[in-house]
């Protein structure tokens, strides 16, 4: 008999959290916290904010930001984008493989100048050994990090 | 040869749906339907809202609410938190795993006073053996149920 | 020994991408690229919009739809809502499985007419083999197809 | 670090126009953040005048509105408050400070020395 | 506008006393107050933010509660330079207001 997984043979799975130095400010990914609190790998690894593939294979990746912001400087109309996109040795720019664009500034009222929104963004892909996925934010200074729970970032193959 | 799940030994999984007797007022979390309709249990258990894990292990845990409103009464928060909490023996205290804040009331018009919103959360975490997790949210008030298509809370192994 | 797949019984998944053509403007569910970029069908096909279920299980399913506009015209119904749902030879009527509502042109303003907001829906579902499941937006000439990333929807076996 | 220092006339006529300016060292204007105009009569507490962004969005206390103008002066990394038709209940030390708007920290962390303002003929 | 009532209005205490001031709002605000020290002839400085967020370089004997519409600003152990005057401000609609001071002496 075959079977697809030997127990040895853990499925890969990850659960990357939001740590107070995930804003880089330099134009790069978000980077994320790997070991602490809720934030693990297995069978996957991380380098510079990037979840790599040890084994290829089809994977459902997802994110979750929490956005935030005191009324709208930016202006009412700024869009914030979230995305999961893929590095690949074979191409030379990062591929987008999930993006939501959202108009959170229309949350916030007269009434209530501190708004919040939240983007989340999941979905099957298949990744190769040695691809690597990562999480941009545009403006992702309306990001809010600090406590893990509320900005997110796993995977796990199916 | 050893395989990781014998066929006897079914992927725990659960989806529990929103239902009149979801909210209960109390300040405690919300409560689920278990078996009607697309509601099922297989391979964890359930107890006063909360899902209970019998076998340990990674499962990616998510919950959806629909939220609703005429307005927004000065008595309702402006901010609405939706969360996913973990409870386990070991600790007094529920533990934050994922967690959203929303301004949904941003939503409304003045040409239709009538808003709609939906929190979705989903992660990879955790769970041992008779640890719990529930979904709350604050305020309630604004959860709408209906059919158990638009709220609901489930689990699987990965 | 008996074990739950084999390596030739591969995990039934499925992950497939807005198109041009995929809104119809006739009535019925979105329509969806199966082969290029990123869609593809593993142990699952695909008939007019549906995803077709050729082994018998639970599966967690998903969407996404990008919503976008300019101002809210009056045509537009000031609630979108998005759905999954499914189809049975059992029953003639299509069955709700996971909707939202949203209300996203509360996100426009005087200032800024253009909007973005987006929508996630997931769970688990039991699917016999030949049930389908289809999504449906209304009002779909809201919804923001462009590059596939932004609107697709997917499902795997759990 | 970004550091606030307001200019501008320490007395005005009355029914005259108060100008006062706030100039920017340490950082860009051009970022996430509300610039604040802050009043405080003497031996009395903190009042918000109102605020302006980098991209000229501006919210103002409904009890001054028909009588303040504020503006940025991008080029300059400055902006400026001006407020009309004053009388001698506008005499007070005005701050300026910057609050900042993005997700993870809020409120009003910089803050100018301060300049006294007297309405009087 | 939203009102923000502070007491006491005003407080003798020694050093080394554990110190509370309330701060009131005339409705819910949820966790969007700050609370600043002022001393005489110098601007407002932050202590806290969102509640309960202590601002970076602020000691740790200052900490904020509450949420919604009762806040509340505890000083662990008074040392000689708190002495000063301290104000609640919310930030959660317009207009922006502050309560009107709570003035802590030395006894």
């Known amino acids: 008999l075959i079977q697809e997984r030997r127990s040895h043979e853990v499925n890969p799975a990850a659960h990357l959290t939001g740590a107070n130095s995930s804003l880089t400010g330099s134009g790069g990914p978000l980077l994320w916290e790997t070991q602490l609190g809720l934030a693990f790998l297995r069978g996957l690894s991380y380098h510079d904010g990037a979840l790599v593939v040890t084994k290829a294979g089809y994977y459902y990746i997802y994110s979750k930001v929490q956005l935030g912001g005191v009324g709208c400087p930016l202006g009412l109309a700024s869009t914030i984008t979230h995305g999961l996109y893929k590095r690949t040795p074979r191409y030379p720019e990062e591929l987008e493989l999930l993006v939501s664009q959202q108009s959170p500034c229309g949350r916030a009222t007269s009434s209530s100048r501190v708004w919040w929104d939240s983007s989340f963004l999941g979905g099957v892909v298949h990744l190769e050994a040695g691809e690597e996925v990562v999480v941009r934010v545009l403006d992702e200074r309306l990001v809010r990090l600090r406590d893990g729970t509320r900005s997110y970032f796993g995977a796990f193959m199916v | 040869l050893i395989q990781e799940r014998r066929s006897h030994e079914v992927n725990p999984a659960a989806h529990l749906t929103g239902a009149n007797s979801s909210l209960t007022g109390s300040g405690g979390p919300l409560l689920w339907e278990t078996q009607l309709g697309l509601a099922f249990l297989r391979g964890l258990s359930y107890h006063d809202g909360a899902l209970v894990v019998t076998k340990a292990g990674y499962y990616y845990i998510y919950s959806k609410v629909q939220l609703g409103g005429v307005g927004c009464p000065l008595g309702l928060a402006s901010t609405i938190t939706h969360g996913l909490y973990k409870r386990t023996p070991r600790y007094p205290e529920e533990l934050e795993l994922l967690v959203s804040q929303q301004s949904p009331c941003g939503r409304a018009t003045s040409s239709s006073r009538v808003w709609w919103d939906s929190s979705f959360l989903g992660g990879v975490v955790h769970l041992e053996a008779g640890e719990e997790v529930v979904v709350r949210v604050l305020d309630e008030r604004l959860v709408r149920l209906r059919d158990g298509t638009r709220s609901y809370f489930g689990a699987f192994m990965v | 020994l008996i074990q739950e797949r084999r390596s030739h019984e591969v995990n039934p998944a499925a992950h497939l991408t807005g198109a041009n053509s995929s809104l119809t403007g006739s009535g019925g569910p979105l329509l969806w690229e199966t082969q290029l970029g990123l869609a593809f069908l593993r142990g699952l096909s695909y008939h007019d919009g549906a995803l077709v279920v050729t082994k018998a299980g639970y599966y967690y399913i998903y969407s996404k739809v990008q919503l976008g506009g300019v101002g809210c015209p009056l045509g537009l119904a000031s609630t979108i809502t998005h759905g999954l749902y499914k189809r049975t030879p059992r029953y003639p009527e299509e069955l709700e499985l996971l909707v939202s509502q949203q209300s996203p042109c509360g996100r426009a303003t005087s200032s800024s007419r253009v909007w973005w907001d987006s929508s996630f829906l997931g769970g688990v579902v039991h699917l016999e083999a030949g049930e389908e499941v289809v999504v449906r937006v209304l009002d779909e000439r809201l919804v923001r197809l462009r590059d596939g990333t932004r609107s697709y929807f997917g499902a795997f076996m759990v | 670090q970004v550091q606030l220092q307001e200019s501008g006339p320490g007395l005005v006529k009355p029914s005259g126009t108060l100008s006062l300016t706030c100039a920017v060292s340490?950082?860009?204007?051009?970022?996430?953040?509300?610039w604040n105009w802050v009043r405080q009569p003497p031996g009395k507490g903190l009042e918000w005048i109102g605020e302006?962004?980098?991209?000229?969005?501006?919210n103002y206390n409904p009890s001054l509105k028909s009588r303040v103008t504020m503006s940025v002066d991008k080029a300059k990394n400055q902006f400026s408050l001006k407020l009309n038709s004053v009388t001698a209940a506008d005499t007070a030390v005005y701050y300026c400070?910057?609050?900042?708007?993005?997700?993870?920290?809020?409120?009003?962390?910089?803050w100018g020395q301060g300049t006294t303002v007297t309405v009087s003929s | 506008a939203i009102q923000l009532t502070q007491s006491p209005s005003s407080l003798s205490a020694s050093v080394g006393d554990r110190v509370t001031i309330t701060c009131r709002a005339s409705?819910?605000?949820?966790?969007?107050l700050a609370w600043f020290q002022q001393k005489p002839g110098k601007p407002p400085k932050l202590l806290i933010f969102?509640?309960?967020d202590l601002e970076s370089g602020v000691s740790s004997r200052f900490s904020g509660s509450g949420s919604g519409t009762d806040f509340t600003l505890t000083i662990s152990s008074l040392q000689p330079g708190d002495f000063a005057t301290y104000y609640c401000?919310?930030?959660?609609?317009?207009?922006?207001?502050f309560g009107q001071g709570t003035r802590l002496e030395i006894k």
């Open positions: 302006v962004s980098h991209s000229g969005i501006t």
């Open positions: 969102d509640a309960s």
């Open positions: 340490g950082g860009s204007i051009s970022s996430i953040n509300w």
């Open positions: 401000q919310q930030f959660n609609s317009y207009p922006i207001t």
């Open positions: 400070a910057r609050e900042r708007a993005v997700a993870d920290y809020h409120g009003m962390d910089v």
């Open positions: 409705q819910g605000i949820s966790s969007a």
